[in-house]
Interface confidence: medium
């Protein structure tokens, strides 16, 4: 298991919510990405190859998410101070072998200007 801080901008704020960006290498074909808040699993997304060109995307702990060819974005809404915490992207790579797990993360700071529905 590889641990480290994200070397990219992991948190993108908009409209009182936050997009948490979890990147993976674009050679990865099949994987599971979990979003952890502290040690708690908030969200997950699994991408697997299927018959022919088919692909299966499944979530056991569903969050609004967006998949690209090198990242999964998880969206958290209605931010408040309780959202401030360490968040980790826990990537399990199934394909290409060998099986590997990487953990990257950072601290989500919540400032008044980022909270939902603040009067400007």
């Amino acid at each position: 298991e590889i641990n480290g801080s994200a070397n990219y901008e992991m948190f993108i704020f908009h409209n009182g919510g936050v997009q948490i960006l979890c990147k993976y290498p674009d050679i990865v074909q099949q994987f599971k990405m979990q979003l952890l808040k502290g040690g708690q699993i908030l969200c997950d997304l699994t991408k697997t190859k299927g018959s022919g060109n088919t692909v299966s995307i499944k979530s056991l702990k569903f969050c609004h998410s967006q998949l690209s060819n090198n990242s999964v974005s998880f969206f958290l809404y209605n931010l408040d101070h309780s959202h401030a915490n360490y968040y980790f992207c826990n990537l399990s790579i199934f394909d290409p072998p060998p099986f590997k797990v990487t953990l990257t993360g950072g601290y989500l700071h919540i400032y008044e200007s980022q909270l939902c529905c603040q009067l400007k």
């Epitope: 099949q30 299927g50 018959s51 022919g52 088919t54 299966s56 199934f94 394909d95 290409p96």
Partner: antibody, heavy 124, light 108 residues
Framework: EVQLVESGGGVVRPGGSLRLSCVAS????????MSWVRQAPGKGLEWVSG????????DYSDSVKGRFTISRDNAKNSLYLQMNSLRAEDTALYYC?????????????????WGQGILVTVSS | EIVLTQSPGTLSLSPGERATLSCRAS???????LAWYQQKRGQAPRLLIY???SRATGIPDRFSGDGSGTDFTLSISRLEPEDFAVYYC?????????FGPGTKVDIK
Amino acid sequence: EVQLVESGGGVVRPGGSLRLSCVASGVTFDDYGMSWVRQAPGKGLEWVSGINWNGGDTDYSDSVKGRFTISRDNAKNSLYLQMNSLRAEDTALYYCARDFYGSGSYYHVPFDYWGQGILVTVSS
Amino acid sequence: EIVLTQSPGTLSLSPGERATLSCRASQSVSRSYLAWYQQKRGQAPRLLIYGASSRATGIPDRFSGDGSGTDFTLSISRLEPEDFAVYYCHQYDMSPFTFGPGTKVDIK
């Protein structure tokens, strides 16, 4: 024990239609992609079509594209193959087969479980 | 599409002998997405090997797979009477998935 049982085969004239069904038991059906594979009499195996776990993604071999439609109903643990504009060369034993995810990971492998096959004969 | 060629077409051997079956792909099968199936007369195919070399659940260790890229082999170390059948290789890397024409292993 996983069981896949096909039905709906028979004799049909060229240009006609058939709908094959495959019912799965002993498995959490919506955990898996599924495929149809066929075998002409005395010949080898040919992959026909595949579908992902929720029916949102499908794929076809060039030989059936535009004529066959794969679908599934997870509530009924069922896989289907609607076959239109049938030709003599579609005559075969049709198997449904389950996609498999290997040893503790999601490393993809077709096909670990197969039905017993259902015969489709296209003849005038 | 990836065309798979198997050789020999027929292999005549006695029980206890070693069988070596070959499968060649017309282009590289990346990530070793190659499987082997056994089919006996009147039965559905049975998965033996996936990922070129991983044995499927319940498959005896006399079956082994090897190879990468375009050249793959299935070996049966000591043929048992129940091993006489047709063997197909299968690539599941690129759509359309394709199968080889098969190698028949029969009793000499």
